[in-house]
Interface confidence: low
């Protein structure tokens, strides 16, 4: 039986040309966490691997790097940055935890201030 | 107790160096990356560089060319070579980890003739 939950940093808004960071946390269950995927849409932005580390796919390795924790920050965000991010937690032996985020990229002077750099 | 202690910050002229340290003790396995943020007065705190244990590096736009990040894996130490400082780099530097997930008391740096 899954009895965890996934809480994410849900909506939020980042300046064109700033950065982001993405965060995910996995609670209530004492599930043993083995991988993290960050995915946008279909595209996987980078995995998090209990043993092997961190593994950032190459056409997003200039712009994403990895954490703190579990999370993911993104720099020199642009408009086709907008959409919808995944974290998807693989645990042992309840299976898998999927957390969503909805990341909106604005112009310089729409973002709302203190809607960047979503640190807990 | 698990626990990372920044240090190295000052106060330094436009164009001076500075190099950052960041110890994590404590951990029952070593990190798999660190990394350094920073928040200035008034500001909302901002990454700045990330190193994988393997040694791939990343940096923020802001600082790439002047600042080096780097990591000694058998003392769980990263550090931040900042050459070229300017006053728009003055502010706190905190040291992460996937380790732990809050944040060091952070080292001052201050930029200024």
């Known amino acids: 039986m899954m009895t965890g939950t996934i809480e994410t940093t849900g909506n939020i808004s980042a300046e064109k040309g700033g950065s982001i960071i993405l965060q995910c946390h996995l609670s209530s269950t004492t599930a043993q966490v083995t991988q993290v995927n960050w995915e946008q849409q279909d595209q996987l932005l980078a995995i998090c691997n209990a043993d092997l580390g961190w593994h950032i796919s190459p056409s997003f390795k200039d712009r994403v790097a990895p954490g703190p924790g579990l999370g993911l920050t993104l720099q020199s965000l642009t408009v086709n940055d907008t959409g919808e991010y995944f974290c998807i937690y693989h645990t042992y032996p309840d299976g898998t935890y999927t957390g969503r985020i909805f990341l909106e990229v604005l112009e310089s002077s729409v973002a709302e201030h203190g809607a960047r750099f979503q640190i807990p | 107790e698990v626990q990372l202690v920044e240090s190295g910050g000052g106060l330094v002229q436009p164009g001076g160096s500075l190099r950052l340290s960041c110890a994590a003790s404590?951990?029952?396995?070593?990190?798999?990356?660190m990394g350094w943020f920073r928040q200035a007065p008034g500001k909302e705190r901002e990454w700045v560089a990330s190193?994988?244990?393997?040694?791939?590096?990343w940096y923020a736009d802001s600082v790439k060319g002047r600042f080096t990040i780097s990591a000694d894996n058998s003392k769980n130490t990263a550090y931040l070579q900042m050459n070229s400082l300017k006053p728009e780099d003055t502010a706190v530097y905190y040291c992460?980890?996937?380790?732990?997930?809050?944040w060091g008391q952070g080292t001052l740096v201050t930029v200024s003739s």
């Open positions: 992460t980890t996937d380790s732990l997930p809050g």
């Open positions: 404590g951990f029952t396995f070593s990190p798999s990356w």
């Open positions: 190193v994988l244990r393997g040694g791939y590096t």
